[in-house]
């Protein structure tokens, strides 16, 4: 955790006046001046009744305030006298002294209250050297501390038992610890006083630092009896448009020409391509123009534009119907969902002066007329020797971002003219053990004379398919077997080529000893 | 084109029925008869019938009366063999065909305990 | 029923060069229509029959023409003219005449 922060109450090393504190009796302590190791002059306060026995020797410091503190630490310093080094002296000779400490709500002591005794004066510890010294070393300075809590009152005195060990008590400080305001987790937490015990954990709630958010709660830290942070709860981290510094101490601001589009730990990042921040602390980078973002992008994409036109668009008429194919755009606006929308305009009129209008509805596409994949696409259904516009757009995921239409290329197309239209309907008129004869009506739309017409017709059973063709609008099939069902289909021929075969409609031979008689029947398409 | 998608291999017991399936797709599906062929692992083929999809109009191979039932469900271009009270014998390779033209890949039907 | 009667192997026959597989029936298979209901396939190991030949000599749509069939009401005949590896399978006749649609035995074309 953080190194922890200790508060002085009192100290004497820093007193160079008297410090008269009270010693009872007064043939006790003593107060002296003397010289710390570092030769600065303090005031000291000595006993060595070594030579009487029953010693009880007391000494009080002033009132020390409390400073709402639950636990206070005693530092001494000391000398001890070894007993061994001292001649012809008594057995009680003590190498020891008691530490006591008396609370109050003000300073009320005097030189006979409380009493110079345990009870009411509270023991902390008896106190013992690490060394001692005799008359022929340097005195070694003992270095002690303790403490003792919690405190409720006021203030407090702190009182030393000599009961007959040859001593000096060079310093006293008084003080309490703290934990250090710090910043953890992007969170920031007060400087807090430790607790009564010395395993008490005082709980100090943080806030998010400057442009922080939180990301779990509480926020809380634990102050130890030491002074020292342990155990985080909850964290903040950096909101969008900042990012870590300092250690995580800090969440800074994304510069100009950077950004984050995420609250959180990660830092500031270029912007993508084709887009810009103009102030700091952006949490996405605005598109240039003519350059968009599409609903589906993420802030972390590039912003891209509308691609340039198909290229290459190449028609092949067929009659009515035809087929165009295209190149891919020279240009794909830097996005890989590019699709393609044809729109048919049929035009009236004669060379520049012709006005154009969109299709009709019974104008089909094959795959489809938009959002196409493929570079090509199958249309029929236009009327013959008629003018038309065909218009291929590429489009992609921002172009209905641009306030634009998208780019296309056209090309300009005349039909030809057209193949019949289906044959309607088949009547049986007819039929046999080994024989079908079939009459239909001509196409509704012949589009020019009729040559012949061809007849396609397989066993269901085998479904495999003969040819057989007619100049007139009826037939007789023969070879076929009895009992068996005939799957048969007609189409019409002009000098435009085929037309298309009529819907598959069924009939049926009789069995080899049947009459053959006639069957009149109009066969609907199945 | 024309595509003929027969159900998955199957592992049956003994005695009970089993119903394999055959997808027709690419063409009109009533205007062709479905044939039903079987093939023991190596033997040769057996014809077992057809049916016509336009009316399940049916013709059986006598030896598989009574031990197969053509169906069809027009709706969803599907024909349908049933096989009942099966022994180790009905353990063959079924396979369905669009007349004398195109032929299933085939379902492995295993009768065994 | 029709029996239709095919031998099991064929002579073994090089690569390149040309084979025969023969097949019989029980009943002449010419129709009065003038057609004759004989149909060959070839099963590829693993794979599902495949049509080679319909009413006799009709080559099926999609068939190399290395591939003929022949023959009178009852003896039929199929040949490759130059056999290739992916000609490798059992090859069966079919008659189409009558119920119920018998095949023959089928004949493994075997190369040398």
């Known amino acids: 955790g953080c190194r922890a922060l200790e508060e002085t109450l009192m100290d004497t090393k820093w007193v160079t006046s008297e410090l008269a504190w009270t010693s009872h009796p007064e043939s006790g302590w003593e107060e002296v001046s003397g010289y710390d190791e570092a030769m600065n002059p303090i005031r000291t306060y000595q006993v060595c009744n070594v030579r009487e026995s029953s010693q009880n020797n007391w000494l009080r410091t002033g009132f020390i305030w409390r400073r709402d503190v639950q636990r206070v630490y005693v530092e001494l310093k000391f000398t001890v006298r070894d007993c061994n080094s001292i001649p012809n002296i008594p057995g009680s000779c003590k190498e020891t002294f008691n530490l006591f400490y008396y609370e109050a709500d003000s300073d009320v002591a005097s030189a006979s209250s409380p009493f110079w005794m345990e009870n009411p004066y509270v023991k902390v510890d008896t106190i013992a050297p690490d060394e001692s010294f005799s008359r022929l070393d340097a005195g070694r300075v003992n270095t002690k501390v303790r403490s003792f809590g919690p405190l409720s009152k006021a203030g407090f005195y702190l009182a030393f038992q000599d009961q007959g060990a040859c001593m000096s008590l060079i310093s006293v400080r008084a003080f309490y610890k703290k934990c250090a305001s710090t910043t953890a987790g992007f969170a920031l937490f007060p400087e807090t006083l430790t607790g009564a015990e010395p395993t008490s954990l005082v709980i100090a709630p943080g806030t998010c630092i400057p442009n922080a958010v939180e990301v779990s709660v509480p926020l809380k830290l634990y102050c130890n009896g030491d002074g020292e942070w342990m155990v985080p709860v909850g964290a903040c981290t950096c909101a969008t448009g900042h990012e870590p510094a300092a250690k995580e101490s800090q969440c800074r601001p994304c510069p100009p020409g950077s950004y984050k589009a995420k609250q959180g730990e990660g830092p500031c990042l270029p912007c993508p391509p084709n887009s810009r921040t103009t102030s700091p602390a952006a949490s996405i980078c605005t598109c240039h123009n003519n350059f968009y973002r599409a609903d589906s992008d993420s802030a972390d994409s590039a912003c891209t534009t509308v691609p340039s036109p198909p290229r290459g668009v190449i028609s092949n008429v067929n009659e009515t119907s035809l087929i165009l194919e295209w190149s891919e755009p020279r240009d794909l606006g830097g996005r890989d969902d590019l699709l393609y929308n044809v729109i048919c305009k049929k035009c009236h009129g004669a060379g520049g002066a012709s006005a154009c209008s969109r299709c009709d509805d019974n104008v089909e596409f094959v795959p489809r007329q938009l959002g196409l994949t493929e570079r090509r696409v199958h249309i029929s259904h236009l009327l013959a020797h008629t003018r038309y516009t065909f218009e291929v757009q590429a489009v992609n995921g921002v172009s209905g971002k641009s306030p634009l239409p998208p780019r296309y290329a056209a090309v300009n197309i005349t039909t030809n003219q057209a193949a019949p239209s289906e044959v309607p309907t088949l009547r049986l008129h007819s039929s046999s053990g080994s024989s079908l004869t079939l009459s239909w009506a001509p196409p509704e739309r012949p589009n020019g004379v009729i040559l012949d017409y061809e007849m396609k017709y397989f066993e269901k059973s085998e479904g495999i398919a003969s040819t057989v063709t007619s100049q007139m609008n009826s037939v007789q099939l023969d070879g076929l077997r009895p009992d068996a069902r005939y799957v048969v289909q007609v189409r019409a021929r002009t000098v435009a080529g085929y037309g298309q075969y009529s819907r598959p409609a069924e009939f049926e031979t009789t069995s080899e000893r049947g009459s053959g008689a006639q069957q009149l029947q109009e066969q609907l398409p199945l | 084109q024309v595509q003929l998608q027969q159900s998955g291999a199957e592992l049956v017991m003994p005695g009970a029925s089993v119903k394999l399936s055959c997808k027709a797709s690419?063409?009109?599906?009533?205007?062709?008869?479905i044939h039903w062929v079987k093939q023991r692992p190596g033997q040769g083929l057996e014809w077992i019938g057809e049916i016509d999809p336009s009316d399940s109009y049916t013709n059986y191979n006598q030896k598989f009366k009574g031990k197969a039932t053509l169906t069809v469900d027009k709706s969803s271009s599907t024909a349908y063999i049933q096989l009942s009270s099966l022994t180790s014998e009905d353990s063959a390779v079924y396979y369905c065909a669009r007349g004398a033209e195109y032929w299933g890949q085939g379902t492995t039907l295993t009768v065994s305990s | 029923d029709i029996v239709m009667t095919q031998a099991a192997f064929s002579n073994p026959v090089t690569l390149g060069t040309s084979a025969s597989i023969s097949c019989r029936s029980s009943?002449?298979?010419?129709?009065?229509?003038?057609?004759?209901?004989l149909y060959w396939y070839l099963q590829k190991p693993g794979q599902s029959p495949q049509l080679l030949i319909y009413r006799m000599s009709n080559l099926a749509s999609g068939v190399p023409d290395r591939f003929s069939g022949s023959g009178s009401g009852t003896a039929f005949t199929l040949r490759i003219s130059r056999v290739e590896a992916e000609d490798v399978g059992v090859y069966y006749c079919?008659?189409?005449?009558?119920?119920?649609?018998?095949f023959g035995g089928g004949t493994k074309l075997e190369l040398k």
């Open positions: 009943k002449s298979l010419l129709h009065s229509n003038g057609i004759t209901y």
């Open positions: 690419g063409y009109t599906f009533t205007s062709y008869y």
């Open positions: 079919m008659q189409h005449l009558e119920y119920p649609l018998t």
